[in-house]
């Protein structure tokens, strides 16, 4: 699929999307992972689910429905806030924390009815309950009533290291896959390209060994890395040329302090 919107997309009606990429078609990419994602459908003017392959694709792809709506539906934020302030909290906001049956250690948020705040908790990955949000924003919007909580709420801190019995697992080495970390990342203002080009190379979660390329924003070059076949992030290209074409264009030449340690 093309990374640009089709010409025909501009004729779809009066509703203009907030961003040009919202007009792009859903693109599952060439990889074979099966990741539940969301895209904005220009034909229906709604955010819809699709299965993403795990690499490449385009910017019309979101991890959550909420993120998609916020990014691509004009006026959505205002109506969402209005609804939240005027309506009662859904029943599921009052459900107790449920890590679920599985033990996958995922960072999630829930509404704590005692503290009246959204807090971070560890979700096991399957079969919990609906008081379980992928982002703090989503939790606040649905369960923290803005009328009753005018002051900003501090997120309850939890270490990015999750204790598993007596051992401590660093998230970057899950499944014994060491994720290469880029030592230097350009300041956001120095990079105007696709946001995923700033992400570190991510080998993913499976066991294959595929040659891929990622854009190193510190060096401005595309480097080789081994991809395991699923998961990972969008900074993942099948050829060096594709990688450069997608990411190199966004770098703004800065004579002095282009990178931050």
């Amino acid at each position: 699929l093309s990374e640009e919107a089709d010409d025909t997309d501009s004729e779809l009606g009066s509703m203009k999307p907030l961003h040009t990429f919202c007009a792009m078609k859903a693109d599952d990419g060439p990889c074979k992972a099966m990741i539940r994602s969301y895209f904005f459908n220009m034909y229906t003017h709604q955010c819809e689910e699709f299965i993403y392959g795990g690499c490449e694709g385009n910017e019309n792809r979101f991890d959550t429905l909420e993120e998609c709506k916020k990014t691509c539906i004009p006026g959505y934020e205002k109506t969402a806030v209005k609804a939240a302030s005027g309506a009662e909290r859904p029943d599921f906001c009052f459900l107790e924390e449920d890590p679920g049956l599985c033990r996958g250690y995922m960072k999630r948020y829930l509404y704590n009815n005692q503290t009246k705040q959204c807090e971070r908790f560890v979700y096991g990955g399957c079969l919990g309950n609906r008081n379980n949000f992928e982002t703090l924003d989503e939790c606040k919007k649905i369960c923290e009533n803005p009328v009753h909580s005018p002051s900003p709420v501090n997120e309850v801190q939890m270490s990015d290291y999750v204790t598993d019995g007596n051992t401590v697992t660093d998230r970057s080495t899950v499944n014994n896959i060491v994720v290469p970390q880029s030592p230097k990342v350009p300041r956001r203002r120095d990079y105007r390209g696709r946001p995923w080009c700033l992400q570190p190379a991510d080998s993913g979660l499976c066991k294959a060994s595929e040659r891929r390329f990622y854009y190193n924003s510190a060096t401005g070059k595309c480097h080789r890395f081994n991809y395991t076949g699923c998961g990972g992030n969008n900074n993942n290209f099948t050829t060096r040329r594709r990688c450069l074409r997608s990411c190199k264009t966004g770098l703004i030449k800065n004579k002095s302090k282009g990178v931050v340690k």
Epitope: M34, L101, G104, G125, E134, L205, C230, G231
Partner: antibody
């Protein structure tokens, strides 16, 4: 090697309570890497999940809506077992009842099953 | 409830030949990390069910490599590359995307 040994009566009268026990060896009912379930099988309904309990920071349970008002699954940590109680039974509850362990770590699934107990509800 | 529909319900097989069982769910069983919330079980005659495949495509310990699971979204397949006599029994798919946990109605595999 985990083993689940079921015990309980094979015949229950209508309107009475069906009680079964599942004794665990090779694992702990309080393990935070497992969950403990009851599933039944009848010719008419196939495999039907009834409910599950699991211990994390505290005990949790979940029941199928079809039996929610009548079912209780309890752990017995002192004997390392868990039990099923199904109240107000009818002939519709006639089935082979299985206890099973849900593996919570890498292998998400019912990886160990009891031998099954045929329970007939009849007067 | 998520409804799991298997086909065929009965599958006569010839030893040494491949076999394939289909399972369809009434809603998608794929989560954001690419894990598929689907398992396969085999219940041999007179025995309790045993776990064959977990998370859609991973073989449980001790399961021969002639068994493989695949599929995404709502359509899943269990394949046996070369059927052996000991593979007879009823095969079930099961979802754990949401409560209640539900099973397919079963596919009975028997030797021709």
């Amino acid at each position: 090697q985990v083993q689940l040994q079921q015990s309980g009566p094979g015949l229950v009268k209508p309107s009475q309570t069906l009680s079964l026990t599942c004794a665990i060896s090779g694992d702990s009912v309080s393990s935070d890497s497992a969950a403990w379930s009851w599933i039944r099988q009848s010719p008419g309904r196939g495999l039907e999940w009834l409910g599950i309990i699991y211990k994390r920071s505290k005990w949790y349970n979940r029941y199928a809506v079809s039996v929610k008002s009548r079912i209780t699954i309890n752990p017995d940590t002192s004997k390392n077992q868990f039990s099923l109680q199904l109240n107000s039974v009818t002939p519709e509850d006639t089935a082979v009842y299985y206890c099973a362990r849900w593996h919570s770590d890498k292998m998400w699934g019912f990886d160990d099953w009891g031998q099954g107990t045929l329970v007939t509800v009849s007067s | 409830d998520i409804v799991m529909t298997q086909s065929p319900l009965s599958l006569p097989v010839t030893p040494g030949e491949p076999a394939s069982i289909s399972c369809r769910s009434s809603q998608s069983l794929v989560m954001s990390r690419g894990i598929t919330y689907l398992n396969w079980y085999l219940q041999k005659p007179g025995q309790s069910p045993q776990l064959l495949i977990y998370k859609g495509s991973n073989r449980a310990s001790g399961v021969p490599d002639r068994f493989s699971g695949s599929g995404s979204g709502t359509d899943f397949t269990l394949k046996i590359s070369r059927v052996e006599a000991e593979d007879v029994g009823v095969y079930y798919c099961q979802q754990y995307d949401s409560y209640p946990l539900t099973f397919g109605q079963g596919t009975k595999v028997e030797i021709k």
